[in-house]
């Protein structure tokens, strides 16, 4: 004969555990029903009656099958530097993540506790490592032959234009100025250079790195429009 299915509440066999979505109530010494996500235990079970569940109130939630007497409070509203990526419902907590241009400086179990603005690299510096959801931008000086004249959390160092005749040589924060109306060519059309490592120039030197520590500094990417004027914001 098949084993009889026990309905909650029931006394478990000695040494056995309660079934999935049930819990053992120490007071009643019975296996009782858990409440579903979005509910909580309004009345605990007895030897003769099962758990009475009730829906979570506004701004509270339970995410798991449970027997908690009260639902958990949803986190406070997202701050101005955050966006709500998951709303507070009866079954899930609100999740706040950092808005574009910011990163999470202090995370919590889900979402972010403290957002901070992404660092903006000043002229002469380019983005060496872009910001992520959880890490800030890393700025490094532009290598010889490259420049950045913007203040930006996204702009990398770009190659100086190459002139037939140079009127003003380029430096880390300024492009070369040509005497002719147009430069002969740009350094490898479409080439965009990350700031480091730096090779030798009059004031800018570096010991030759080991091959394993010298990342490629040239990435072929489509070139964007010419940058804003010196000191303007590039993002």
């Amino acid at each position: 004969l098949p084993a009889q299915v026990a309905f909650t509440p029931y006394a478990p066999e000695p040494g056995s555990t309660c079934r999935l979505r049930e819990y053992y109530d120490q007071t009643a010494q019975m296996c009782c029903s858990k409440c579903s996500p979005g509910q909580h235990a309004k009345v605990f079970c007895t030897k003769t009656s099962d758990t009475v569940c009730d829906s979570c109130e506004d701004s509270t939630y339970t995410q798991l099958w449970n027997w908690v007497p009260e639902c958990l409070s949803c986190g406070s509203r997202c701050s101005s530097d955050q966006v709500e990526t998951q709303a507070c419902t009866r079954e899930q907590n609100r999740i706040c993540t950092c808005r574009p241009g910011w990163y999470c400086a202090l995370s919590k179990q889900e979402g972010c506790r403290l957002c901070a603005p992404l660092r903006k690299c000043r002229p002469g510096f380019g983005v060496a490592r872009p910001g992520t959801e959880t890490s800030d931008v890393v700025c490094k000086p532009c290598a010889p032959g490259t420049f950045s004249n913007t203040t930006s959390s996204t702009d990398i160092c770009r190659p100086h234009q190459i002139c037939n005749v140079v009127a003003i040589p380029g430096n880390a924060s300024m492009d070369a100025v040509c005497t002719s109306t147009s430069p002969t060519r740009s350094m490898a059309p479409g080439a965009v250079h990350l700031p480091q490592p730096v090779s030798t120039r009059s004031q800018h030197t570096q010991p030759t790195p080991e091959p394993s520590t010298a990342p490629s500094t040239s990435f072929l990417l489509p070139m964007g429009p010419s940058p804003p004027a010196e000191g303007s914001t590039g993002d």
Epitope: R119, K120, C121, R122, P123, G124, F125, R129, V138, C139, K140, P141, A143, T151, N171, A172, S173, M174, Q196, P197, V198, Q203, H204, T205, Q206, P207, P209, T213, E230, G231
Partner: antibody, heavy 119, light 107 residues
Framework: EVQLQQSGPEVGRPGSSVKISCKAS????????MHWVKQSPGQGLEWIGW????????DYAEKFKKKATLTADTSSNTAYIQLSSLTSEDTATYFC????????????WGQGVMVTVSS | NIVMTQSPKSMSMSVGERVTLTCKAS??????VSWYQQKPEQSPKLLIY???NRYTGVPDRFTGSGSATDFTLTISSVQAEDLADYHC?????????FGGGTKLEIK
Amino acid sequence: EVQLQQSGPEVGRPGSSVKISCKASGYTFTDYIMHWVKQSPGQGLEWIGWVDPEYGSTDYAEKFKKKATLTADTSSNTAYIQLSSLTSEDTATYFCARDDGSYSPFDYWGQGVMVTVSS
Amino acid sequence: NIVMTQSPKSMSMSVGERVTLTCKASENVVTYVSWYQQKPEQSPKLLIYGASNRYTGVPDRFTGSGSATDFTLTISSVQAEDLADYHCGQGYSYPYTFGGGTKLEIK
């Protein structure tokens, strides 16, 4: 907490060299370049140059190209300045200062090292 | 090289007075000017960056302003602990340069 701890005072003979250190803690050493700044007694501040600990690349003010050598050791999170061919003009306090590449080149400073050149 | 000229060289003020220090750049440095406070026998500390941004923990009596070539540091109500040398510096182009400093004495 970001800290830049510099080595103790140095006395050097004219013509000799000294090497002073700046040990960084409280941040990722390779994410920031390190500047060195000179302050002669009763004088203003003079920028010497910077070293990028990640790549060992450097840049110097013209005046200090033959005088100073900047290096960094990532295993100990320490930046160094070596001053060569010392003269009385090199008697000064030397500061290291961190730079994140954003608005200000010098957001944290070491406490400074007094170098005295005397025969 | 960009020359940064600070004035006055020194000044003596009473507690509670308003102090204005100026810094002039020989070329346009946009807003890449910082102000540093150096108390006797100490290293410089960053007060203002980007011409007008107060650094973390700096009292709000310190205010920076200006752009291009003319910059000002104002202490709205000077305190005894503000006795120090004040340096301006440009971080716009190499070589980075500083003003000669202003020595602030308290009467």
